[in-house]
C-alpha cells in the first residue's frame, strides 16, 4: 500500500460494566473493538469500510489501559493500510463490543453485544505527529490517537510519490521527504546518472564516466584536458589546436626541426667574426682582417 492509517487505543473506561442497551455484562464486559475507516461523510452511514476495517482480540474487561504491542494478535497501534492517494479527509467508526466467546477471535463468536461506538469525521494530513482525542458518552470513555503515514518508498503529502534509493547504471540518488530525487555526491541530471567530472575538466575536450574523473578526448592531454597534443614529429614547436606544430622562434619546417638561427644556436664563427643566417642550417662567417677560413679559424 501507499500509506497506513494508524490508530492507537490508549484507555477504555466502562466502570459500571454496561452494554449500550442498558444491560450489564456478566461477569464483566470482555471488550474488543471493531474499527471501520471510510471516505469522508458529512453524516456517517452504514455500508462498506471503503478505506479498510480491522478487529482486535479481547483487550480487557470493563476498564483497562491498552499497551503498545508491535506484533502478533492485539497489535497496537492498529494498522489500516491503503493503496491510493490519501485524500486528506476520512470518517472513522470505533465500536467497543462485549464477547462471551473466544478471546483471540471474538469477531466470530455468537452473542456479541455492542458496548459503545464513536464516530470521527474530519481532515487529516499525512505526518508523523499523532492526533490525540478522547470521546465520552454517559457510560464509557475512550482515549486514542491516530495519524496517517506513508508506507516505505512512498512520499509526499498524499503518499502518492514513489521513490527508492538507487545506486547503479540507471541512477545514483536517494529520496527527499517530498519524494523528489536527491543525487548522491558526484552525480547530476534528472535521473542522477550524469557524473560530475573533476573540477576544471575542460567541457569540450574532457569527459568522465565516473565522478572526479577527467578523460581526454583525442588530441588533448593534461590533468584537465586543456593542453593540446602537437603533431607527432613536432620538435621545436607548440600547438593551440591538436596535431598542430607552430614553430618556436628560429625554427622552421613541417616538424619545426630545421634550424633557422644556426648562428645563435651554435656560434660557428670564430675570432670575433660576424655570423649571418642563410636558410635552414645555412650560415656565413664574415672574418675580421687577418683571419680566413669557413669559420674564420685560420
Amino acid at each position: 500500500g501507499s500509506g497506513i492509517f494508524q490508530l492507537r487505543l490508549q484507555e477504555f473506561v466502562n466502570q459500571r460494566g454496561m452494554l449500550a442497551n442498558g444491560q450489564s455484562c456478566e461477569p464483566g464486559c470482555r471488550t474488543f473493538f471493531r474499527i471501520c475507516l471510510k471516505h469522508f461523510q458529512a453524516t456517517f452511514s452504514e455500508g462498506p469500510c471503503t478505506f479498510g476495517n480491522v478487529s482486535t482480540p479481547v483487550l480487557g474487561t470493563n476498564s483497562f489501559v491498552v499497551r503498545d504491542k508491535n506484533s502478533g494478535s492485539g497489535r497496537n497501534p492498529l494498522q489500516l493500510p491503503f493503496n491510493f492517494t490519501w485524500p486528506g479527509t476520512f470518517s472513522l467508526n470505533i465500536q467497543a463490543w462485549h464477547t462471551p466467546g473466544d478471546d483471540l477471535r471474538p469477531e466470530t463468536s455468537p452473542g456479541n453485544s455492542l458496548i459503545s461506538q464513536i464516530i470521527i469525521q474530519g481532515s487529516l494530513a499525512v505526518g508523523k505527529i499523532w492526533r490525540t482525542d478522547e470521546q465520552n458518552d454517559t457510560l464509557t470513555r475512550l482515549s486514542y490517537s491516530y495519524r496517517v503515514i506513508c508506507s516505505d518508498n512512498y512520499y509526499g503529502e498524499s503518499c502518492s510519490r514513489l521513490c527508492k534509493k538507487r545506486d547503479d547504471h540507471f541512477g545514483h540518488y536517494e529520496c527527499q521527504p517530498d519524494g523528489s530525487l536527491s543525487c548522491l555526491p558526484g552525480w547530476t541530471g534528472k535521473y542522477c546518472d550524469q557524473p560530475i567530472c573533476l573540477s576544471g575538466c575542460h567541457e569540450q575536450n574532457g569527459y568522465c564516466s565516473k565522478p572526479d574523473e577527467c578523460i581526454c578526448r583525442p588530441g588533448w592531454q593534461g590533468r584537465l584536458c586543456n593542453e593540446c597534443i602537437p603533431h607527432n614529429g613536432c620538435r621545436h614547436g607548440t600547438c593551440s589546436i591538436p596535431w598542430q606544430c607552430a614553430c618556436d622562434e628560429g625554427w622552421g619546417g613541417l616538424f619545426c626541426d630545421q634550424d633557422l638561427n644556426y648562428c645563435t644556436h651554435h656560434s660557428p664563427c670564430k675570432n670575433g667574426s660576424t655570423c649571418s643566417n642563410s636558410g635552414p642550417k645555412g650560415y656565413t662567417c664574415t672574418c675580421l682582417p687577418g683571419y680566413t677560413g669557413e669559420h674564420c679559424e685560420l
Epitope: N153, R161, L162, C163, K164, R166, D168, H169, F170, G171, C175, G179, L181, G189, K190, Y191, D193, Q194, P195, Y207, S209
Partner: nanobody
Framework: QVQLQESGGGLVQAGGSLRLSCAAS????????MGWYRQAPGKEREFVAS???????YYADSVKGRFTISRDNAKNTVYLQMNSLKPEDTAVYYC????????????WGQGTQVTVSS
C-alpha cells in the same frame, strides 16, 4: 506506461557481428537513460551497456571495445552494435528503461536471443 520491443538477435559465428534494436513506445524523453542487460542460461541477469542524458555511455568490462550502444531520440530507439562476438556472449539480451525514482518498477522488454557458435 512504457513498452519495449527488442529485435536483431540470432545465431552468429564467433568473431561475427549483430546489431540489436530496442524500440520504446510510450512516454520516453531524451533524458531517460536506456540500457541493455543479458542473461545466460543458469546465470543472473547482468548489465551490458547503458546510454544516458547527453549520450554518456557505460559498458561492462567484458564488452568494452567490442560493443557500442547508441540511441536515436527521434525514433525512441536504442541500439547495441556487437562486434567480435564470443561464445560467452550467448544470452537473452534485454532492453531496459528505469522507472523514475524506483528500481523495482523498471520497464523491461521481452528479450531477444543471441547465440554465438564456435
Amino acid at each position: 506506461q512504457v513498452q519495449l520491443q527488442e529485435s536483431g538477435g540470432g545465431l552468429v559465428q564467433a568473431g561475427g557481428s549483430l546489431r540489436l534494436s530496442c524500440a520504446a513506445s510510450g512516454n520516453i524523453s531524451v533524458w531517460i537513460p536506456m540500457g541493455w542487460y543479458r542473461q545466460a542460461p543458469g546465470k543472473e541477469r547482468e548489465f551490458v551497456a547503458s546510454i544516458g542524458e547527453g549520450s554518456t555511455t557505460y559498458y561492462a568490462d567484458s564488452v568494452k571495445g567490442r560493443f557500442t550502444i547508441s540511441r536515436d531520440n527521434a525514433k525512441n530507439t536504442v541500439y547495441l552494435q556487437m562486434n567480435s562476438l564470443k561464445p560467452e556472449d550467448t544470452a537473452v539480451y534485454y532492453c531496459a528503461v528505469p522507472y523514475y525514482g524506483h528500481s523495482d518498477y523498471d520497464y523491461w522488454g521481452q528479450g531477444t536471443q543471441v547465440t554465438v557458435s564456435s
